[in-house]
Amino acid sequence: MAVTACQGLGFVVSLIGIAGIIAATCMDQWSTQDLYNNPVTAVFNYQGLWRSCVRESSGFTECRGYFTLLGLPAMLQAVRALMIVGIVLGAIGLLVSIFALKCIRIGSMEDSAKANMTLTSGIMFIVSGLCAIAGVSVFANMLVTNFWMSTANMYTGMGGMVQTVQTRYTFGAALFVGWVAGGLTLIGGVMMCIACRGLAPEETNYKAVSYHASGHSVAYKPGGFKASTGFGSNTKNKKIYDGGARTEDEVQSYPSKHDYV
């Protein structure tokens, strides 16, 4: 039961995390105008990975996409790449983990295969989360650098005659969404990896023989000793060709007449 719970929770946490990464990537508020001495501004600027926007106090908002690819800063391109890689890996991870879930039965998929898929999706979630965290952190670092540079140049006008106030940008909501989402995806991935350990049959260097206490039938089960007690019920009336990989969270019941090989 604990393994299924861990796997399920890992999946849900990762799903929320990846949804958050997608949301953060699409959001326009990666950087917002710093209202350092003016909490209410008549013109408010904010920027995303794909476009920049201006919101006026009239209520009018205008957004313009970055229609150039070569003219954009390399750092912005890198952040875009990291976020997209994170989304792609996360999406593949979600797809893999759906089939890996213990509560979902697909044909006669072995538990060892499910364990491998759980591990694969877990690793994908971890990498996805790290990509998102890295992308957001790179952008945040870029903002901090530009912030202090613009602060240094804040009131450098032509001979001090005309004030040219430079617009400074600070952390936008998307950065926090990205950090949290990346963290959740990472945690979800770790949970999937932990669940994989519970799913995986422990390899031994001998063949386990399972004895049924109920009668004459003897089930020979190659595989891990963990599942070799032979007391698990096979209520679905299907033959036990699963290599003996049983887990503690499968329903345990007394042997019945359906226990056969």
């Epitope: 008549a42 013109v43 600027n45 201006v54 430079q166």
Partner: antibody, heavy 115, light 113 residues
Framework: EVQLVESGGGLVQPGGSLRLSCAVS?????MNWVRQAPGKGLEWVAW????????TYADDFKGRFTISRDDSKNTLYLQMNSLRAEDTAVYYC???????????WGQGTLVTVSS | DIQMTQSPSSLSASVGDRVTITCKSS????????????LTWYQQKPGKAPKLLIY???TLESGVPSRFSGSGSGTDYTLTISSLQPEDFATYYC?????????FGQGTKVEIK
């Protein structure tokens, strides 16, 4: 079509109070009060976001004037306290539009502060 | 606060003349986010409310005749009436629309010569 109709102006003694109203019809995201003293130029008084109620004032009016709105009546208000002789002016309510320009103005209401 | 200085304070002109009014701001009104200058021009006739002519320094408000045009960037702006018409005799104001508090120029009165 946007329509703005001011009311509430009149004669008031120095130190007195007055509340101006502006009946609004049509789409208004943000509204303002702008005044014009006799024979003088235009002076912006206050701004309000009609959805959030967030206000902003010119420094000369902070603490004395309060801009507010009543959604149910679709009315904009300017509560003026501690009035001085120099507050004598025609008060306009005006809608802010794209580019932060005032496109629709009321007909104006005259406020005279005199003893 | 941003100070707005208009010149001249008044001018006399004849119908058909080309008229130019300048407005200078104490700070740049150019917004880096959209590269637009937040300067607005108004026309006011005696006893009437002002009328919006131009916003974003050069964008003509709908219904305003094309003889009116605006230009400029940063701190220096110009309103031009290419061919003055009888109905154009009025007072013209520029406005800082970039930051609170919104501030107006002192006005330029265009009179008949």
């Amino acid at each position: 079509e946007v329509q703005l109709v001011e009311s509430g102006g009149g004669l008031v003694q120095p130190g007195g109070s007055l509340r101006l109203s502006c009946a609004v019809s049509g789409y208004t995201f943000s509204m303002n009060w702008v005044r014009q003293a006799p024979g003088k130029g235009l002076e912006w008084v206050a701004w309000i976001n009609m959805y959030t109620g967030e206000p902003t004032y010119a420094d000369d009016f902070k603490g004395r004037f309060t801009i507010s709105r009543d959604d149910s009546k679709n009315t904009l208000y300017l509560q003026m306290n501690s009035l001085r002789a120099e507050d004598t002016a025609v008060y306009y309510c005006a809608r802010l539009v794209r580019g932060n320009g005032f496109d629709y103005w009321g007909q104006g209401t005259l406020v005279t502060v005199s003893s | 606060d941003i100070q707005m200085t208009q010149s001249p304070s008044s001018l006399s002109a004849s119908v058909g003349d080309r008229v130019t009014i300048t407005c200078k701001s104490s700070q740049s009104l150019l917004n880096s986010g959209n590269q637009k200058s937040y300067l607005t021009w108004y026309q006011q006739k005696p006893g009437k409310a002002p009328k919006l002519l131009i916003y974003w320094a050069s964008t003509l408000e709908s219904g305003v005749p094309s003889r009116f045009s605006g230009s400029g960037s940063g701190t220096d702006y110009t309103l031009t009436i290419s061919s003055l018409q009888p109905e154009d005799f009025a007072t013209y104001y520029c406005q800082n629309a970039y930051s609170f508090p919104f501030t107006f120029g002192q006005g330029t009165k265009v009179e008949i010569k």
